[in-house]
C-alpha cells in the first residue's frame, strides 16, 4: 500500500437529515501499526489551527457542534474511515479532513477531503437547451446519503407534461448516492417560463423540501404585431412597428427591396420614416430570426401626394388629314383625374389613371392651337400647356377682294395656311406679277394661321383690272381672281418698265 485517501470531493445532505461520508485510506504495509487511530477535522487540515474535531478515535472529545452528531461507521483497522453525521444543520457545511494516526511519526492529514453541502431544495436538472416541439427529459435529483432517512420524490406543476418515471437510487461517480425522478415531455412555446417543482419528503418525519425550475423553452419567432397597410401624406412622419414572440429574442430586421433599413435584437422594432416622400412608397418587410427559425411579414406603405406636372409626349406638328396621338402622363397618389382641354372645351378625360391618350383622327386646321393637360387629386392640381400645329395647303378666304377708292385700288388677299405661304398678285392684263417681297406695293400681316396681304395700286382711272392672288406653301398653291367691291373709277399706277 501507499499513503492515500479516497472520499467524495463533494457530498450533499438535506438539512435535518444525516450524511454518511464514504472514506477509505491506505498506508504502506511495512508500517504495521499495532492500532490505527484517526481524527476527522472540520474546515482545516492542520491541528495547529485548532479546527473543530468532528470525531477522534482515541477519545470521546469532539467539538460542541458535533456533540452527539458524529459517529465512525468505518473500521479504521480495515482502513475504512467512513463518517456519519446526524441531524445536520447549515453550519456543518464545509470541508472534512481525515487524519490517520498510525503511531510513531506517522500521523498524516490526507490532502483529499470532502466538502459537505447542506441543502434544502431538490435539484431540478433541465437540459441546457429545451426546444419547443422536441422531447425533453427533466430530472429531479436529491442526495440520498443518509442510511437512516430515505427521500421520496414527487413532481409539482407537471400537469399535462407527462407521467414521471422514478429511476430510484443511483450511485454517482465518487460513491455518493442520489434519488432520481424523470419527467419526459414535448414542450410547447407556451411552456416557456412555466414553473416546474419537485418535492422531497421523508416518511415518518415532518421534513419536506421543495425546489422549482423555470422552463426556458427555446422557440422560433412568430411575428405577432405589425401595421396593416399604411397610408401617409407626403412630408408626414410614419412609424412602422414589428413585434415578434420568440425565445431567445429575435434579430428583427426592417427591409425594403433587399436593403436593410434597421435591425436590432429585440422583441419589437420601430422603423421611423421622417418626412416621407413618394420614393419611400412600397412594400416593407420585417424579418424575425433566431437560432431556432424565422418568420417574415410585409406591410405596404402608400405615400399620398399631389400630381406632378404632367408631361406631354407625341406629335406636336401634323399635316392636315393625319391622325394625331398625344399622351399626357403624370404621377400621383392616388391616381388623378386627367383632362385635356382646348379653349375650355374638354376633349378627353380619365379618372384614377396616370396617363391620358388623346387621339385626333384626320386633323384639320381647326385642331391647331393651344391645349392644356390638367391632373388633379385631393392633394392638388397641376397643368401643362402644349401647342398642336396642323400644317395644310393655303386656303384663300372669301374676304379676299379688291376695292377702289379715289386714286387707289386696294386688293386684299386673305390666306389661311400652315406653314406661312408666299403670296403673289398677278395682273394678267398687264402681264405683271407682284410678290409680297415688293414692300412698296405689298403689305403683309399675319394673325395666327391667317395671312393678310394688301396690294395697293395707284394711278389713272380705268376699267377695273383683273387681279389674281396666288398663295403657295409646301403643301400646294391656290389662286383666286379677286372680286371688286363697288364700281368706282380706277386709279392706276404704272408698275414695271
Amino acid at each position: 500500500g501507499h499513503w492515500g485517501a479516497w472520499m467524495p470531493s463533494s457530498i450533499s445532505a438535506f438539512e435535518g437529515t444525516c450524511v454518511s461520508i464514504p472514506c477509505r485510506f491506505d498506508f504502506p504495509d511495512e508500517l504495521r501499526p499495532a492500532v490505527v487511530h484517526g481524527v476527522w477535522y472540520f474546515n482545516s487540515p492542520y491541528p495547529k489551527n485548532y479546527p473543530p474535531v468532528v470525531f477522534k478515535s482515541r477519545t470521546q472529545v469532539v467539538h460542541e457542534s458535533f456533540q452527539g452528531r458524529s459517529r465512525l461507521l468505518g473500521d479504521l483497522g480495515l482502513r475504512n474511515c467512513t463518517l456519519l453525521l446526524s441531524n445536520v444543520s447549515p453550519e456543518l457545511g464545509g470541508k472534512y479532513y481525515f487524519r490517520g494516526d498510525l503511531g510513531g511519526y506517522n500521523q498524516y492529514t490526507f490532502s483529499e477531503h470532502s466538502v459537505l453541502d447542506i441543502v434544502n431544495t431538490p435539484n431540478i436538472v433541465v437540459p441546457p437547451e429545451v426546444v419547443a416541439g422536441t422531447e425533453v427529459e427533466v430530472s429531479c435529483m436529491v442526495p440520498d446519503n443518509c442510511p437512516e432517512l430515505r427521500p421520496e420524490l414527487s413532481w409539482l406543476g407537471h400537469e399535462g407534461l407527462g407521467e414521471p418515471a422514478v429511476l430510484g437510487r443511483l450511485r454517482e461517480d465518487e460513491g455518493t448516492w442520489v434519488q432520481v425522478s424523470l419527467l419526459h415531455f414535448v414542450p410547447t412555446r407556451e411552456a416557456n417560463g412555466h414553473r416546474l417543482g419537485c418535492q422531497a419528503s421523508f416518511p415518518n418525519t415532518t421534513l419536506q423540501f421543495e425546489g422549482y425550475a423555470s422552463m426556458d423553452v427555446k422557440y422560433p419567432p412568430v411575428i405577432v404585431e405589425m401595421n396593416s397597410s399604411v397610408e401617409a401624406i407626403e412630408g408626414s412622419h410614419v412609424s412602422l412597428l414589428c413585434g415578434a414572440d420568440s425565445n431567445p429574442p429575435p434579430l428583427l430586421t426592417w427591409m425594403r427591396d433587399g436593403t436593410v433599413l434597421r435591425e436590432a435584437v429585440a422583441e419589437s422594432l420601430l422603423l421611423e420614416l421622417e418626412e416621407v416622400t413618394p420614393a419611400e412608397d412600397g412594400v416593407y418587410a420585417c424579418l424575425a430570426e433566431n437560432a431556432y427559425g424565422q418568420d417574415n411579414r410585409t406591410v405596404g406603405l402608400s405615400v399620398m401626394y399631389a400630381p406632378w406636372k404632367p408631361t406631354v409626349n407625341g406629335t406636336m406638328v401634323a399635316v392636315e388629314g393625319e391622325t394625331v396621338s398625344i399622351l399626357c402622363s403624370t404621377q400621383s397618389n392616388p391616381d388623378p383625374i386627367l383632362t385635356i382641354f382646348k379653349e375650355k372645351q374638354i376633349l378627353s378625360t380619365v379618372i384614377y389613371e396616370s396617363e391620358l391618350q388623346l387621339e385626333l383622327p384626320a386633323v384639320s386646321p381647326e385642331d391647331d392651337g393651344e391645349y392644356w393637360c390638367v391632373a388633379e387629386n385631393q392633394y392638388g392640381q397641376r397643368a401643362t400647356a402644349f401647342n398642336l400645329s396642323v400644317e395644310f395647303a393655303p386656303v384663300l378666304l372669301l374676304e379676299s377682294h379688291c376695292a377702289a377708292a379715289r386714286d387707289t385700288v386696294q386688293c386684299l388677299c386673305v390666306v389661311k395656311s400652315n406653314p406661312e405661304p408666299s403670296v403673289a398678285f398677278e395682273l394678267p392684263s398687264r402681264n405683271v406679277t407682284v410678290n409680297e417681297s415688293e414692300r412698296e406695293f405689298v403689305y403683309s400681316e399675319r394673325s395666327g394661321l391667317v395671312l393678310t396681304s394688301i396690294l395697293t395700286l395707284r394711278g389713272q382711272a380705268q376699267a377695273p383690272p383683273r387681279v389674281i392672288c396666288t398663295a403657295r406653301n409646301l403643301y400646294g398653291a391656290k389662286s383666286l381672281e379677286l372680286p371688286f367691291q363697288g364700281a368706282h373709277r380706277l386709279m392706276w399706277a404704272k408698275i414695271g418698265p
Epitope: H2, W3, P28, E30, L31, R32, P33, A34, P45, Y46, P47, K48, Y50, R99, L102, G103, G104, Y105, N106, Q107, Y108, T109, S111
Partner: antibody, heavy 126, light 112 residues
Framework: QVQLVQSGSELKKPGASNKVSCKAS????????MNWVRQAPGQGLEWMGW????????TYADDFTGRFVFSLDTSVSTAYLQISSLKAEDTATYFC???????????????????WGQGTLVTVSS | DIVMTQSPDSLAVSLGERATINCKSS????????????LAWYQQKPGQPPKLLIY???TRESGVPDRFSGSGSGTDFTLTISSLQAEDVAVYYC????????FGQGTKLEIK
C-alpha cells in the same frame, strides 16, 4: 549552534505532578518535532512520543497515554513534559530530542532524532 | 511494535581493533516507497544524552569519525568501529523509526 536545554533534576513524592521543560535555540523551533525519551537508571532508552511543534499535535506511545502530557510554548521555543500522579517507577532521566518534520506530519522522509537535551532526572520517592 | 534485538549485550575489544555490533529487527525496516532502511545508531556515554552516529542504516552524521560505519538492510544491521579508540567506550543503541519508534536494549563496549 543547536542547543536543547532542559530544566534541572527534581525529587518528587508519589502522587505529585512534575513538569519538565526543554528550551530550544539555534534553529527554527517549529521546523522540528520534539520527542521525549525515558531512561530508567541502568536501563535502555524508551520512546515516549513526540509533539508536532508546527501543528501542536501530540502523539503518545502506547505505554505513555493518560498521565503524560506534551505541550508547547512556541513564543519561547519551549516544549514541556508534564507527568501527573507520579509513581516510583517513573524515576528516570527524561530526554527531549528534536527531529525534522514536514507539515503534513507524515514521516515519509524518515526523520531521525539528531540533537538531544542533556536530560532531566526525576526521582519519585516518599 | 517492531522489536529490536542487539548482540552482544557487551563487548570488549583491544584499542586499535575492529568492533562489530549487530542489530536484528522483528520486521523489515526497509520502506518500499523510497527503498531506505529506517535505522539509526546512537552512542551514549555515562551521564550524557545519546549522540547520533548513523542514520538510513549507513549514512554517517556530520562530525562523526569515519572509523564508524553502518551496513545491512531489511532486518539485519551492523555497526562497525574499524579501529577502536579509548573515547569510543560507551553504550551503543540501534533505533528504528519506520513505525512506532523503538530502540535495541543496548550493547556496552569496553576496552580489553
Amino acid at each position: 549552534q543547536v542547543q536543547l536545554v532542559q530544566s534541572g533534576s527534581e525529587l518528587k513524592k508519589p502522587g505529585a505532578s512534575n513538569k519538565v521543560s526543554c528550551k530550544a535555540s539555534g534553529y527554527t523551533f517549529t521546523n522540528y518535532g520534539m520527542n521525549w525519551v525515558r531512561q530508567a537508571p541502568g536501563q535502555g532508552l524508551e520512546w515516549m512520543g513526540w509533539i508536532n511543534t508546527y501543528t501542536g499535535e501530540p502523539t503518545y506511545a502506547d505505554d505513555f497515554t493518560g498521565r503524560f502530557v506534551f505541550s508547547l510554548d512556541t513564543s519561547v521555543s519551549t516544549a514541556y513534559l508534564q507527568i501527573s500522579s507520579l509513581k516510583a517507577e517513573d524515576t528516570a532521566t527524561y530526554f527531549c530530542a528534536r527531529n525534522p518534520i514536514n507539515y503534513y506530519g507524515i514521516n515519509y522522509e524518515g526523520y531521525v532524532m539528531d540533537y538531544w537535551g542533556q536530560g532531566t532526572l526525576v526521582t519519585v520517592s516518599s | 511494535d517492531i522489536v529490536m534485538t542487539q548482540s552482544p549485550d557487551s563487548l570488549a575489544v583491544s584499542l586499535g581493533e575492529r568492533a562489530t555490533i549487530n542489530c536484528k529487527s522483528s520486521h523489515s525496516v526497509l520502506y518500499s516507497s523510497n527503498q531506505k532502511n529506517y535505522l539509526a545508531w546512537y552512542q551514549q556515554k555515562p551521564g550524557q544524552p545519546p549522540k547520533l552516529l548513523i542514520y538510513w542504516a549507513s549514512t554517517r552524521e556530520s562530525g562523526v569519525p569515519d572509523r564508524f560505519s553502518g551496513s545491512g538492510s531489511g532486518t539485519d544491521f551492523t555497526l562497525t568501529i574499524s579501529s577502536l579508540q579509548a573515547e569510543d567506550v560507551a553504550v551503543y543503541y540501534c533505533h528504528q523509526y519506520l513505525s512506532s519508534l523503538t530502540f535495541g536494549q543496548g550493547t556496552k563496549l569496553e576496552i580489553k
